[in-house]
Interface confidence: medium
């Protein structure tokens, strides 16, 4: 890759408000590669991190015996980070296809940025309570990885066959849906 295309990092993160802020719907959207893109009349030469999304998750915590009294709210970092000129027709363009080439040496990923530790109380069936310290995500960021980072995790976790497809939009959807699945 040329430096002009990949070396500039802007910290623009898309933050959609999910339609259904319940645990399952937001998590499924994150895991199945649901996309929200911001195309807000930016200058055509502006480079942004397209698609890194902070999804709000609401879930109950259980250790197998006890369950949290109130739901835990946290962020799920989802989507891809794509530093490229924001153009109305960027999906499917030659640049994008080249960028998502399986052999690309540098890729960007939407990852956890900030976390905080909080105590959460669990109610047990016998009437007792337990307190746990857990880490929750509070912000997301785009981070540059080498291809090896991406391939290593895909190697370990992936469920669906990893064959690349020509249309990069489909390919990214396939890889996102397998990200949190089993081999």
């Amino acid at each position: 890759f040329k430096n002009d295309a990949t070396e500039i990092l802007y910290s623009h993160v898309v933050k959609p408000v999910p339609a259904h802020p319940s645990s399952n719907s937001t998590l499924n959207q994150a895991r199945n590669g649901g996309r929200h893109f911001s195309n807000t009349g930016l200058d055509r030469n502006t480079r942004v991190q397209v698609g890194c999304r902070e999804l709000r998750s609401t879930k109950y915590i259980s250790d197998g015996q006890c369950t949290s009294i109130s739901p835990l709210k946290e962020l799920v970092c989802a989507g891809e980070c794509l530093p490229l000129p924001v153009l109305p027709n960027w999906i499917g363009g030659g640049y994008g296809t080249k960028y998502w080439s399986r052999r690309s040496s540098q890729e960007w990923r939407c990852v956890n940025d900030k976390t905080r530790t909080q105590r959460i109380q669990l109610q047990c069936q016998d009437g007792s309570t337990r307190t746990y310290k857990i880490t929750v995500v509070t912000a997301c960021k785009c981070k540059r990885y080498t291809r090896q980072h991406n391939e290593s995790s895909h190697n370990f976790e992936s469920m669906s066959p990893a064959k690349p497809v020509q249309h990069h939009r489909e390919r990214k959807r396939a890889s996102k849906s397998s990200k949190h699945s089993m081999s």
Epitope: V111, N112, T146, Q148, H149, E151, S152, S153, H154, N155, F156, E157, S158, S160, P161, A162, K163, H180, M182, S183
Partner: antibody, heavy 113, light 107 residues
Framework: DVQLQESGPGLVKPSQSLSLTCSVT?????????WNWIRQFPGNKLEWMGC???????NYNPSLKNRISITRDTSKNQFFLKLNSVTTEDTATYYC??????WGQGTTLTVSS | DIQMTQSPSSLSASLGERVSLTCRAS??????LSWLQQKPDGNIKRLIY???TLDSGVPKRFSGSRSGSDYSLTISRLESEDFADYYC?????????FGGGTKLEIK
Amino acid sequence: DVQLQESGPGLVKPSQSLSLTCSVTGYSITSGYYWNWIRQFPGNKLEWMGCISYDGSNNYNPSLKNRISITRDTSKNQFFLKLNSVTTEDTATYYCARGGLLWGQGTTLTVSS
Amino acid sequence: DIQMTQSPSSLSASLGERVSLTCRASQEISGYLSWLQQKPDGNIKRLIYAASTLDSGVPKRFSGSRSGSDYSLTISRLESEDFADYYCLQYASYPWTFGGGTKLEIK
């Protein structure tokens, strides 16, 4: 049901090459996934050696880079580990695995004269 | 390479007890950590991946969590089949690297 089965000579002399085979049933190695070799030394330390992907590309552990080769025979649905110039330090149980979830049962290899 | 420091190296516990094993990563691994169980016959089974996601068929008494660079495997109530060796594995980048293992024995 997907299964992986390692096979090999059991005993190799120092300075020779070792060759192991992982036979895969129930899934084509060209259809997807990455296919790994991992070994476990006496004393139970585990080491990832390398992998071959569904499209035939490789990644190797840098500690073995000059000695290791992972190849495949798609017609037999097998992939192979070749390790050159072995020493007694290569005595271990060798596992093949599909991704991180499906592991073979392991084959023990001893390097001794 | 990323070093994985696992503790304790051995642990004696009783049936029904709650136990926790810990792994610390020498570099950021962004939650790309798995826990493996190895039975005395040598068979290796993945229990957890992505730090806290339980594999299909793994009993709910197993759970994984993360606090910074520390990752934990907790077994809420030990059963006889849980006495085995446990390894953490980071797969954030190649080469994958393993913790030194924890031998979980019956007290």
